[in-house]
């Protein structure tokens, strides 16, 4: 399915979170081992009634710099974001599309590990992998290599370590060409691919109707973002939780900080930062507690992540034309009618008083004045026959009086205008309106 | 479009007091002639008593100086203060507007009263 509106063009990027993984106890600060965006992804527009294409994602690996020793266990958070690309008042709109999360081990200088997650309709592929900046070696990046020109006992393409310079260390050298963005090697000579990427080199985009691949170079965090299979069929489970299939189902085997039918219930705790445009996270800072956002006005979404349309409240009254500026809501009110939420009808009688002691009347929300004696018009300017207006309802007749006009009403009917009538026609010993009508709908007499 | 809902009917003994209200919406009531029927069972409706626009009310022979009908239009509801209620009365009461703005006419959907010992 698009990720965009029709109306609207849209594209995509995405925020990595990451954290040490390594204390139950301490809630450590967001995102405390790094965290990074990605590059925008190509500006993409649905076209009506075309069938979904392929998903144009952010160009380039994402990497996340981290200072210090890597932990070997981690957290991480990653958001697929909606940047709309429209005329929106303060620039472009942000909201968040799919949230994963997870805890994992992870040895630096290992191979790409590859993750499937799944947010709603959503899944996430991904790949990743810890990699130690030169001269930071080893498992957790805390050994350090001697400079090249420093002298070496290791033989040829080997290069000395300290502290223990008997360890020497072959750099692993994949097949030639192999691209240093989609591809990656174990052993020396290989070229293994990363989701998404295919043939010798790793430099053929995948394309399948069932993924929604990247377009050109891709993303080392994201290989595709696809609506989920069914049940054990490309793992229910979300958070690396393992499926097994049941007599009836499927039951998933959660990783710690994970729960729900489908280990759905994140582990992300308000020490994440979980919470978007100024909402407040409530909840225990232990990993396997969960939180609750508690949304400033104008957002919502379990996140705050979405912000709230105001106007599909219908807060304008009486047919206004509902604004939402983003800081206020503004009615445009229709004619004859004003108030912030147009909740005013207006007889206009204020800014325009009737002549000759005319009366001014509502008139359909605009402005209407009732004549005196011998005056008309719209504002009792004009000299009249009283009687012109037929004042006189169910065919009462007028006469035009000294005092004011008088109504001879027809038999039947009575009231200062014969707007009573003493039976109402067609209501026998057993409707409860007259035929036709039901209670409330409006009869029409001339 | 206008929109009437009675409340206030009920049972009650001979001589006793009843007061009526219909709440208007779609227009206020300082606009609309208002007016309560009632239909007791085997006879046609019949108007009761009535209030125009300027103010101005009318009554039918049987009820005068028993019944009184008045309009609140902060409220915008118009009611009917029924005192020295007869067995006779015993009807289901309908709230009606006449709209001059398109001459239509509006009724609620009706509201029981039953006077009975």
């Known amino acids: 399915r698009s990720p965009c509106s029709a109306r609207l063009p849209c594209r995509l990027f995405f925020r990595v979170c990451l954290k040490p993984g390594l204390s139950e106890e301490a809630a450590e600060s967001p995102c405390a081992l790094g965290a990074a965006l990605s590059a925008r992804g190509p500006v993409y527009t649905e076209q009506p009634g075309a069938p979904a294409p392929d998903l144009p994602l952010p160009d380039g690996l994402l990497q996340v710099p981290f200072r210090d020793a890597w932990p070997g266990t981690f957290s991480f958070i990653i958001e697929t974001w909606r940047e709309e690309l429209g005329d929106q008042i303060g620039g472009p709109a942000w909201s968040l599309l799919a949230r994963v999360a997870g805890r994992r081990r992870l040895a630096a200088g290992g191979p790409w590990a590859r993750d499937i997650q799944r947010a709603g309709a959503w899944e996430l592929r991904f790949s990743y992998r810890a990699r130690c900046e030169p001269p930071a070696v080893g498992t957790a990046c805390t050994r350090l290599c001697r400079p090249r020109s420093a002298p070496s006992r290791c033989g040829p393409g080997l290069r000395p370590c300290a502290p223990l310079e008997d360890e020497c260390e072959a750099p692993l050298v994949c097949r030639a060409g192999c691209s240093p963005e989609h591809g990656f090697c174990e052993q020396p000579g290989e070229c293994r691919c990363l989701e998404g990427w295919t043939g010798p080199l790793c430099t053929v985009p995948v394309s399948t109707s069932s993924c929604l691949s990247p377009r050109g170079p891709s993303s080392a965090t994201t290989g595709c973002l696809v609506p989920g299979p069914g049940p054990c069929d490309g793992n229910p489970c979300a958070n690396g939780g393992s499926c097994s299939e049941t007599p009836r189902s499927f039951e998933c085997t959660c990783p710690r900080g994970f729960y729900g039918l489908r280990c759905e219930v994140s582990g992300v705790t308000c020490a994440d930062g979980p919470c978007f445009n100024g909402g407040l996270c409530v909840g225990g800072a232990d990993p396997d507690s969960a939180y609750i956002c508690h949304c400033p006005p104008g957002f919502q979404g379990s996140n705050c992540e979405k912000r709230v349309d105001r106007c599909s409240l219908q807060p304008c009254r009486n047919g206004g034309l509902c604004l939402d500026l983003g800081h206020a809501l503004r009615c445009r009110c229709r004619a004859g009618f004003a108030g912030p939420r147009c909740e005013h009808d207006l007889d206009d009688c204020a800014g325009r008083a009737c002549a000759n002691g005319g009366t001014c009347v509502e008139g359909g929300g605009a402005h209407r004045c009732s004549c005196a004696l011998g005056f008309g018009g719209r504002d009792c300017r004009e000299r009249a026959d009283p009687c012109a207006a037929r004042p006189c309802a169910h065919g009462g007749r007028c006469y035009a009086h000294f005092s004011g006009l008088v109504c001879a009403c027809a038999p039947g009917y009575m009231g200062a205008r014969c707007e009573f009538p003493v039976h109402p026609d067609g209501a026998s010993a057993l409707p409860a309106a007259p035929p036709g009508l039901r209670p409330g709908d409006p009869q029409r007499y001339l | 479009q206008v929109q009437l809902q009675e409340s206030g009917g009920g049972l009650v003994q001979p001589g006793g007091s009843l007061r009526l209200s219909c709440a208007a919406s779609g227009s206020s009531v300082s606009f609309l002639s208002m007016a309560w029927y009632r239909q007791a069972p085997g006879k046609k409706r019949e108007l009761v008593a009535g209030?125009?626009?300027?103010?101005?009310?009318n009554y039918v022979d049987s009820v005068k100086g028993r019944f009184t009908i008045s309009r609140d239009n902060a409220k915008n509801t118009v009611y009917l203060q029924m005192n020295s209620l007869q067995p006779e009365d015993t009807a289901v009461y309908y709230c009606?507007?006449?709209?001059?703005?398109?001459?239509?006419?509006?009724w609620g959907q009706g509201t029981q009263v039953t006077v009975s010992s």
């Open positions: 209030i125009s626009t300027d103010g101005s009310t």
């Open positions: 009606y507007a006449y709209r001059w703005v398109g001459r239509y006419t509006y």
